[in-house]
């Protein structure tokens, strides 16, 4: 390997004499954090990803560039630009020791420095079977819409383009940033270099064996030939990517990331910025059989992270390890033994496993559905893919039992029409991070920036918890969670919907004085309610048991526990209408359920009383779940006595619209 | 404008060996391999092979038996078939076509093996 | 490979429209969304006319389509008119090459 020190020495040679007595002090009061991969071996120690302030221009990131290297030659220290970044990130990369840190994390406009690391490839004909609607036959798989009006950006290997299942359907771009590979004596075979990134356009939009038959593709080579990028090289392809966009605006972009790494704060950056210029993006949850949330861009909230399952919708075993889970995840689809085309030959196919495979599929629907609605939004997209999906046929016991419930039980499916679904009030349930068991933690979820929150509920496997509540961050509704003394800490639930015109608040009645409960309603003509939280200050809400049903010709209204503060949501959009729907257990049961109607959408999920044997309510799908202790600590007494409260509503005027357009 | 532009009609000995070329504009070359097809007077088209502009990879029909040779030229854009020991029925017309979809055709060359 | 087979010859006056059938296997055009149809007019280069079972290029007339049931692929033309007289081709996928059909001669009275 060539000796890079000899031309970036050159360059710093330059710069010695520039000036660099200018450096401005960073901002008051604002302190430049570093960050590096939480795995060992994944660490890219000497090159450093250094994010600039949100509103900084090029020129600014060019000359901070510029500082560091001049503040770092009058230290003896060589440093090179690698890269500026602008259009997505501000920022550069640079190639520098670690001693530089402290003095990088003071120059003017950082907002943070990040080491790079690395990202690996994720893989290891029942796929199309699986996804496809039971009225077509697999053997005769003609999707209503093959994506053609979409372009799908694949971010992987080297691809053979000319490969009989994808001739003429991939644009091989000439982006490449790929590290070398590693060891003295690795042979670099063509095929074996292409054999993952050929795999995946063929399974997105392979003549025989791909889901959208009708995509464009274009690849961007970021993996070696061992399967290996950088965070680095994979920030700068999506950079590409924008500068495309941004000079040639086409239809609808599906970025496919078939990768992972460790958790990493510049490229779910990078994703989010992307994902909000109106690009989706699709990725790998990860084949290490562990928490999404640990890795990237998997934990990224704002990409569609797609788990793995099996023919028999059991989750993927990749040897040792199998796909990843948890509340990252936004659903499943086919990652064992999926055809697609081998660049063996022109005309080889071979199967391959994975999550990468998996997140094809998903990229591969998503163009469908975006090529017959090219104006749906990221949301509305993310929204109908859970929407259409296949509900709990996956076995939960493969999961690890706390994960259980916030690894989301559904495998990815073609709707059974591409249009016509603009009538479906479509919500999605949102889990936060655990909050910790400190007395004072809180944990957050937040809904996507064109979702509303229509309610908020909060779960504890120990049961100590003090509620939750919606209250306004950044002028939008968050749901916020509170543990409680000695607890494990606690989860907030946030069901997520999309309600266009929508105009919502949240309604709050004070811990009541009297013995009756406390009572919180929608005062505002046309305002309906869609869910109700409760929060208290006290550590243990007893077995005051306030009245169960609401009074006749009052379902605006909010119930609970009179030592809890209660808050009502209430929203007016055009034709909404909710219904309350309650189901009561006398006898303690660990679980109570109510499921909406047909046609009925479940925005809130709550539990009467709120006493300190729930566990807490959250929404599975279209069913309001209410968890309590075990019943063998409970006993038999009216304290176990439970009921689960679900609101349920649906929008006349998105069904009326839906008509009008069909 | 997509075109492939073939060489000129070749009249060969029985034994000889013929190559004809391929000149492909107007596209990414490397998406695409060359298909080779032949059409014996009076009669219907015959896949003969692929070759690819990517990587120099080969698919042949088993009915060439090891006496044809495809070849690219990526800095020329130029696909080659040879074909060696030349018999009577291999008079035809030879056409190269892009890709094994086979949408672009080139104008065909006469290739006639007489004694 | 065996060669697909089609009809020696179809015919149809102006206005009518005629069908063109090409038989195969599970291997070849049973297996494969990849049926295409080619037009050869005497001493012309062949032209695309359907590509992938049912799909026409840009510039070929709504008059062509393509449909496949089973091991069978056909080709309609619909309106027949005189300039559509010409040698027809189908041609499939098979695992590891490319097989065409015999060729009908479709004339126009």
């Known amino acids: 390997q060539e000796d890079e020190d000899g031309d970036y020495e050159e360059l710093v040679l330059a710069l010695r004499s520039e000036e660099d007595g200018l450096a401005e002090a960073p901002e008051h009061g604002t302190t430049a954090t570093f960050h590096r991969c939480a795995k060992d071996p994944w660490r890219l120690p000497g090159t450093y990803v250094v994010v600039l302030k949100e509103e900084t221009h090029l020129s600014q990131s060019e000359r901070t560039a510029r500082r560091l290297q001049a503040q770092a030659a009058r230290r003896g220290y060589l440093t090179k630009i690698l890269h500026v970044f602008h259009g997505l990130l501000p920022g550069f990369l640079v190639k520098m020791s670690g001693d530089l840190l402290e003095l990088a994390l003071k120059l003017p406009h950082v907002d943070y420095i990040e080491e790079d690391s690395s990202v690996f490839a994720q893989s290891i004909p029942w796929n199309l079977e699986r996804i496809t609607p039971p009225r077509y036959r697999a053997d005769e798989y003609q999707p209503p819409d093959g994506g053609s009006l979409v372009e799908v950006y694949l971010l992987d290997t080297s691809i053979q383009s000319d490969h009989r299942e994808i001739e003429g359907r991939v644009m091989v771009t000439d982006f490449e940033n790929v590290p070398e590979e590693d060891g003295t004596r690795f042979h670099r075979q063509a095929s074996k270099c292409d054999s993952h990134g050929t795999h995946l356009a063929g399974v997105v939009s392979g003549r025989d064996a791909g889901v959208a038959k009708g995509a464009s593709m274009r690849s961007l080579r970021v993996l070696n030939c061992q399967g290996k990028g950088t965070v680095s090289g994979t920030l700068i392809g999506l950079e590409f990517i924008r500068k495309s966009q941004l000079v040639q605006p086409v239809g609808p972009l599906v970025v496919l990331l078939p990768l992972a790494g460790g958790y990493s704060r510049v490229l779910n950056a990078a994703c989010q910025r992307l994902a909000r210029a109106g690009v989706v993006l699709v990725t790998a949850a990860g084949n290490f059989r562990d928490d999404a949330c640990l890795y990237s861009p998997a934990s990224a909230p704002e990409v569609i992270t797609v788990g793995a399952t099996n023919a028999q919708d059991q989750p993927v075993t990749l040897g040792t390890l199998g796909t990843n889970f948890g509340r990252c995840v936004d659903l499943f689809a086919p990652g064992e033994d999926i055809i697609g085309a081998s660049s063996d030959c022109s005309t080889c196919f071979v199967s391959q496993s994975g999550t990468s495979q998996a997140a094809a599929h998903v990229a591969g629907i998503a163009a469908m559905m975006l090529s017959a609605e090219p104006e749906l939004t990221l949301a509305e997209l993310r929204q109908r893919l859970i929407h259409f999906s296949a509900k709990d046929v996956i076995n939960e016991a493969w999961f690890p039992e706390d994960q259980r419930v916030l690894t989301p039980n559904l495998v990815a499916a073609l709707p059974p029409s591409t249009h016509g679904a603009g009538w479906q009030l479509f919500c999605r349930t949102v889990w936060s991070a655990h909050s910790g068991p400190t007395r004072m933690a809180t944990a957050v979820a937040r809904c996507a920036p064109d979702e509303e929150l229509l309610s908020c509920s909060s779960f504890s496997r120990s049961g100590k918890r003090r509620g939750e509540r919606m209250e306004a961050q950044g002028g939008k509704l968050v749901c916020r969670a509170h543990n409680a003394f000695g607890g494990e800490g606690v989860y907030a639930i946030a069901r997520c919907c999309l309600l266009p015109q929508a105009n919502c608040s949240v309604h709050t009645a004070p811990p009541a004085e009297a013995s009756m409960g406390t009572r919180v309603h929608c005062h505002q003509q046309g305002h309906v309610l869609t869910g109700c939280s409760s929060h208290w200050e006290v550590e243990d809400l007893g077995t005051h048991k306030p009245p169960v049903l609401r009074p006749r010709g009052q379902p605006n209204q909010c119930v609970g526990h009179r030592e809890a503060s209660i808050h009502a949501s209430c929203c007016h959009a055009p034709g909404l209408e909710c219904k309350v729907k309650e189901h009561g257990i006398p006898a303690p049961q660990e679980q109570v359920t109510v499921a909406c109607e047909e046609g009925w959408t479940l925005t809130g999920c709550s539990a009467l009383p709120g006493t300190s044997h729930v566990l807490g309510a959250y929404a599975v799908d279209n069913t309001c779940v209410v968890r309590s202790r075990d019943v063998s600590t409970t006993g038999s007494t009216s304290e176990g006595a439970v009921t689960a409260v679900a609101i349920c509503c649906r929008s006349r005027h998105l069904a009326q619209a839906s008509q009008e357009l069909q | 404008e997509v075109q492939l532009v073939q060489s000129g009609a070749e009249v060969k000995k029985p034994g000889a060996s013929v190559k004809v070329s391929c000149k492909a504009s107007g596209y990414t070359l490397t998406s695409y391999g060359i298909s080779w097809v032949r059409q014996a007077p009076g009669q219907g088209l015959e896949w003969m092979g692929w070759?690819?502009?990517?990587?120099?990879?080969?698919n042949y029909a088993q009915k060439l038996q090891g006496r044809g040779t495809m070849t690219t030229d990526p800095s020329t854009s130029t696909a080659y078939m040879e074909l060696r020991s030349l018999r009577s029925d291999d008079t035809a017309v030879y056409y190269c076509?892009?890709?094994?979809?086979?949408?672009?055709w080139g104008q065909g060359t006469t290739v006639t093996v007489s004694s | 490979e065996s060669a697909l087979t089609q009809p020696a010859s179809v015919s149809g006056s102006p206005g009518q429209s005629i069908t063109i059938s090409c038989t195969g296997t599970?291997?070849?055009?049973?297996?494969?969304?990849?049926v295409s149809w080619y037009q050869q007019h005497p001493g012309k280069a062949p032209k695309l006319m359907i590509y992938?079972?049912?799909n026409r290029p840009s510039g070929v007339s709504n008059r062509f389509s393509g449909s496949k049931s089973g091991n069978t692929a056909s080709l309609t033309i619909s309106g027949l008119q005189a300039e559509d007289e010409a040698d027809y081709y189908c041609?499939?996928?098979?695992?590891?090459?490319?097989?065409f059909g015999g060729g009908t001669k479709l004339t126009v009275l």
């Open positions: 599970s291997s070849d055009v049973g297996g494969y969304n990849s």
């Open positions: 041609n499939s996928y098979t695992s590891t090459s490319m097989v």
């Open positions: 992938e079972v049912s």
């Open positions: 070759v690819s502009f990517y990587n120099g990879n080969t």
């Open positions: 076509a892009r890709g094994y979809g086979m949408d672009v």
